[in-house]
Amino acid sequence: SSPCPQAWGPPGVQYGQPGRSVKLCCPGVTAGDPVSWFRDGEPKLLQGPDSGLGHELVLAQADSTDEGTYICQTLDGALGGTVTLQLGYPPARPVVSCQAADYENFSCTWSPSQISGLPTRYLTSYRKKTVLGADSQRRSPSTGPWPCPQDPLGAARCVVHGAEFWSQYRINVTEVNPLGASTRLLDVSLQSILRPDPPQGLRVESVPGYPRRLRASWTYPASWPCQPHFLLKFRLQYRPAQHPAWSTVEPAGLEEVITDAVAGLPHAVRVSARDFLDAGTWSTWSPEAWGTPSTGTIPKEIPAWGQLHTQPEVEPQVDSPAPPRPSLQPHPRLLDHRDSVEQVAVLA
């Protein structure tokens, strides 16, 4: 068997660090057997069998000119093997961040904080940190570890499925190369890293007969699990075309009626979502949707507010892709104290 331990990486390659002493090992001989060393393609003897170093070649203060292929020969001139030297650095701790688009799963991504120049792989795992008794400062030994399954195709990402919203997790990402390993530990709680995807299906419609009104409606992001326990709240922004500043409102449900639109101008509208108990952060904004208030006249009969309101108050359906959030306040009225002013303006 070879006297040379096989480092992780391609066979026949040995590794060292620039500026450091490097030992190359002749793979096809018995440990301690004296050998001669040559650079591949060069007749000059680098180190003879009488060096006292046996099957090893020592390169003091290796640099990039030392990289390449070496040949070792036994005393009788037989080929002891070929070795390729590659120089690089031990791993540094990778940079890791984790994010969650819902309350059941989270993903972690990583990048090397320093390029080693050597073949590199990553080991990813996690533990659940559990609390002992009422004293939340005392923690029991962590449960796990379990592997954090990595994305196929070499994407630097792993996903934890079926996480518990109230638990804390310790993520372990270890960078491994032939010169060593280096680990970054990251403590995460789903509550703090939760950032929903933006709401979907944003539509902006005029309200016939009301030149200063727009009705915006949207749905929950498809990635948000369909259970009524964890709801989203929303933030809506709107502005007339060519106007630099956004106006912001926090709607009570999955629609909002804007009552101070600028008559005749197209308006941009966008929405963002957040856990309704303020866990984590607001989502990115949805793509903008555009709408222009109606220019038509008032309908002859103004329907009662209950008839105008198109979204009945229903309990979230488990099979519904976008469960409406039970209102914490009444839906915005489509007719309010400003209606008479608006009607006069229309009729004038």
Epitope: A92, V95, S111, P112, Q114
Partner: antibody, heavy 118, light 107 residues
Amino acid sequence: EVQLLESGGGLVQPGGSLRLSCAASGFTFSWYSMTWVRQAPGKGLEWVSSIVPSGGHTQYADSVKGRFTISRDNSKNTLYLQMNSLRAEDTAVYYCAKPEDWGMFDLWGRGTLVTVSS
Amino acid sequence: DIQMTQSPSSLSASVGDRVTITCQASQDINNYLNWYQQKPGKAPKLLIYDASNLQTGVPSRFSGSGSGTDFTFTISSLQPEDIATYYCQQYDNLSPTFGPGTKVDIK
């Protein structure tokens, strides 16, 4: 020679913007994370932001999050800090630094002074 | 964020004296602690990394020790050129933080 050289500092009004640059030489810039650290006059050191070699991960101090953007151009061996919505408390000497393992700063530039004042 | 405290905030000592500065982290940072020297008008210089390792080219009179939350930096024999401010800094997490500094001068 291994060195870092900052530029782009100067006097700017509150609410204004400035872009700092850091030119690196003497080492393989694209292999290393890079960092900005600042020091207000007569005060201590404050880490501002860091970026990994690929540019794919960035990290910011809470005091600058949402206002400052760190970036890099590995083909030009240059690190940048775009500073928007500047405040009086951003007045400082800004140092570019090369860390080992993200946070061990073994190489520093000479710094560039940013003054935010009306 | 992890808070770093240093003591004393300043000290005066005679040439040849042994000088000790302590640094405390608000939580366990393993040995991810560095010490820097900064002279007036100059950039900081790394002296000690990972709590106790001497950076290449730094005189052996500088040393560091500690692990977890409590760390010590020592100048075994103070020299006139050591007049400077010394900072500890943690990098256990992705947001490195510095101590407030200790100003050292000669009596």
